[in-house]
């Protein structure tokens, strides 16, 4: 059964040009996270394996840097960055749990952090 | 010990499909991309695209990309490509080739399959 | 895309002799989160798939005599096979796996003189 709950940081929103950081945290269970995939809109961003380390998809190498933990950076933001971004982690024994994050990159300076939202 | 075992050589007519197989054993399969590379008669190597079965993500060579699909089936640690409206410059050796590209070890495409000769012809 | 352009097409080289091939690329390999260049070299011989000798540019893959040697960085890379032996008569191929599509050298052909 899976009882684990991921907390994502939510909506947020950033300007274009700089930069930010989607994290995913999973709690509320003892399973082994084996791996976290990152993706945007079904395209593979980065994948952290628990045994292999990082891979950054080369088609975001310059503007994408792991981390911190197994959250991703992104720079250089643009406003076709905005979209849906998705934490996929793989865990033993439970399987996959799936966080949600959406980013909008304004014109403006007046980028905003949303809240923090959780899914089961 | 880390082995790509391919199905056989096949012969085919133009404008039909081939599937080659690609079974993987010694490591484990969701791990490593595997890749598929071509070498026509007396030339040299070109990249189809890959695969990363840990997620099912697949990257293609825009010149093949409207004929060719690259699957996994993680159950049985076997690759699929699949090459349609087949023409008679697709003879070649289609090898598989297991990718290892994370950004701590990054050994490129370590281990190979022994090949699978296609063949196309009227 | 990126071109890998290999040169000499062709090189005869006598027993014991340095052999040297040069491997260009249309854009740099150079990552800088972790400072390696993307670039590998295969060999291979008649009749057999390749096989992988070097990665990052100068790291050889376990089992790889220590005569095969590669160096380089951003652009012009090189493999030099210090003192030819008859087992290393094949073709040499560069690849860069820096973006997609991964692209190879057109290959360079090793023989004895």
């Known amino acids: 059964m899976m009882t684990g709950t991921i907390e994502t940081t939510g909506n947020i929103s950033a300007e274009k040009g700089g930069s930010i950081i989607l994290q995913c945290h999973l709690s509320s269970t003892t399973a082994q996270v084996t791996q976290v995939n990152w993706e945007q809109q079904d395209q593979l961003l980065a994948i952290c394996n628990a045994d292999l380390g990082w891979h950054i998809s080369p088609s975001f190498k310059d503007r994408v840097a792991p981390g911190p933990g197994l959250g991703l950076t992104l720079q250089s933001l643009t406003v076709n960055d905005t979209g849906e971004y998705f934490c996929i982690y793989h865990t033993y024994p439970d399987g996959t749990y799936t966080g949600r994050i959406f980013l909008e990159v304004l014109e403006s300076s007046v980028a905003e952090h949303g809240a923090r939202f959780q899914i089961p | 010990e880390v082995q790509l075992v391919q199905s056989g050589a096949e012969v085919k007519k133009p404008g039909s499909s081939v599937k080659v197989s690609c079974k993987a054993s010694?490591?484990?399969?969701?791990?490593?991309?595997i890749g598929w590379v071509r070498q026509a008669p007396g030339q040299g190597l070109e990249w189809i695209g890959d695969i990363y079965p840990g997620g099912a993500y697949t990257n293609y060579n825009e010149k093949f990309k409207d004929r060719v699909t690259i699957t996994a089936d993680k159950s049985t640690s076997t690759a699929y490509m699949e090459l349609s409206s087949l023409r008679s410059e697709d003879t070649a050796v289609y090898y598989c080739?297991?990718?290892?590209?994370?950004?701590?070890?990054?050994?490129?495409?370590?281990?190979w399959g022994q090949g699978t000769l296609v063949t196309v012809s009227s | 895309d990126i071109v890998m352009t290999q040169s000499p097409d062709s090189l005869a080289v006598s027993l014991g002799e340095r052999a040297t091939i040069n491997c260009k690329s249309s854009q740099s390999l150079l990552y800088s989160r972790n400072q390696m260049n993307y670039l590998a070299w295969y060999q291979q011989k008649p009749g057999q798939s390749p096989k992988l000798l070097i990665y990052w540019t100068s790291t050889r893959e376990s089992g790889v005599p220590d005569r095969f040697s590669g160096s380089g960085s951003g652009t012009d890379f090189t493999l030099t096979i210090s003192s030819l032996q008859a087992e290393d008569v094949a073709v040499y191929y560069c690849?860069?796996?820096?973006?997609?599509?991964?692209?190879f050298g057109g290959g360079t052909k090793v023989e004895i003189k």
């Open positions: 690849q860069q796996y820096y973006s997609y599509p991964y692209t």
């Open positions: 080739a297991r990718g290892d590209y994370y950004d701590s070890s990054g050994r490129a495409m370590d281990y």
């Open positions: 010694g490591y484990t399969f969701s791990n490593y991309w």
